[in-house]
Interface confidence: medium
């Protein structure tokens, strides 16, 4: 079935950046790292410097949810995080802007930010029982939960 | 530690402009955007606007555009807020104010600093 | 802009006691509200962001709730060092208008 967003009419109005250069350590403590130009994975670093730093831009909706909808962009680049689909890698997608608005089939581009205490969960708004989440020996991914890894430590002005 | 440390008191003559400093330390200073609210006597809090300190961009409130300018000094930490066309009503206590995006709250304020007063009178 | 009407504008209670203080939005803020408090000469300090977070540091006698256009400020048990206004403040849209404060005073 056509995931949830494709079939509203929901429209995201870019807000502004809220965080920058931050990095995402998952709850084995591993940080997301580049793989390779086009996927993510994580690794337990001894060195920060190694770790991708996130800036994360928040967006509003049409429809004045309560939810906090969200972007993620490799900081000092212009790839953004973008949803596939369930246990698909995550791909860093090139655009030369942030968007101003994404609707529709644009949503991959979006996450809705959870937080319970320290604990941070980024939702995919066009799949939204999917999280980014990290996987034994394999890249950043879309999952629903276990196995995966779907709970990250947001670590801020490592710089 | 935060801190904010801001110029010192003012006074001013109507139709004169006034430019408010705002040190910052403690913290990195181009992470968190910094917002300027003013505090007439006896009066609640009138949030002016902001700068994003990582892109030097401004963002003003509608009653002050076009009299207010926000400027940056990023190798001093420092953020300036210059009013001009001053009038009595200008009078008021001048804060700046970290931004911080506390989960669910656009535009929270945690650190803010001591104020500066500006007094206009002819 | 979105108002913010508090209540009461003062209010004066004794060392002990619990005090609630109202703030109402003009529109829904989807929980937005963030509550600060000023003691007389110094600067605001926040307290609670996303209606009921506390800022960490801050004493656990405070407290905040609501949703949609209505939202409370708990001190439930008043101590001295709580003299103060305090403000309400809207996260939602800008220009991110403020209460026009509560003045608490010891009985």
């Known amino acids: 079935s056509a995931p949830f967003s494709f079939l509203s009419n929901v429209k995201y109005n870019f807000m502004r950046i809220i965080k920058y250069e931050f990095i995402l350590n998952d709850a084995l403590n591993q940080s997301i790292i580049r793989a390779n130009d086009q996927y993510l994975t994580a690794a337990a670093l001894h060195n920060l410097d190694e770790a991708v730093k996130f800036d994360m831009g928040a967006y509003k909706s049409s429809k004045d949810d309560a939810k906090i909808t969200v972007i993620l962009r490799i900081s000092k680049t212009q790839l953004y995080v973008t949803a596939q689909d369930e246990d698909q890698p995550v791909l860093l997608k090139e655009m030369p802007e942030i968007p101003k608005t994404i609707t529709g089939s644009e949503t991959n581009l979006l996450f809705f930010w959870e937080t319970h205490g320290t604990k941070n969960y980024f939702t995919s708004v066009a799949h939204p029982n999917l999280f980014i989440a990290t996987k034994q020996d394999y890249w950043v991914c879309l999952a629903g939960g276990p196995p995966s890894i779907t709970d990250f430590q947001i670590l801020e002005n490592q710089a | 530690e935060v801190q904010l440390v801001q110029s010192g008191a003012e006074v001013k003559k109507p139709g004169a402009s006034v430019k408010v400093s705002c040190k910052a330390s403690g913290y990195t200073f181009k992470y968190y955007g910094m917002n300027w609210v003013r505090q007439a006597p006896g009066q609640g809090l009138e949030r002016m606007g902001w700068i994003n300190t990582y892109t030097g961009q401004s963002t003003y409130a509608d009653d002050f555009k076009g009299r207010v300018t926000f400027t940056l000094d990023t190798s001093t930490s420092t953020a300036y807020m210059e009013l001009s066309s001053l009038r009595s009503e200008d009078t008021a206590v001048y804060y700046c104010?970290?931004?911080?995006?506390?989960?669910?709250?656009?535009?929270?304020?945690?650190?803010w600093g001591q104020g500066t007063t500006v007094t206009v009178s002819s | 802009d979105i108002q913010m009407t508090q209540s009461p504008s003062s209010l004066s209670a004794s060392v002990g006691d619990r005090v609630t203080i109202t703030c109402r939005a003009s529109q829904d803020i989807s929980n937005m509200l963030n509550w600060y408090q000023q003691k007389p000469g110094k600067a605001p300090k926040l307290l609670i962001y996303y209606t009921s977070r506390l800022k960490p540091g801050v004493p656990s006698r405070f407290s905040g709730s609501g949703s949609g256009t209505d939202y409370t400020f708990t001190i439930s048990s008043l101590q001295p060092e709580d003299i103060a206004t305090y403000f309400c403040?809207?996260?939602?849209?800008?220009?991110?208008?403020f209460g026009q404060g509560t003045k608490l005073e010891i009985k």
């Open positions: 403040q809207q996260g939602k849209t800008a220009p991110y208008t």
């Open positions: 104010a970290r931004d911080i995006y506390y989960y669910g709250s656009d535009f929270a304020m945690d650190y």
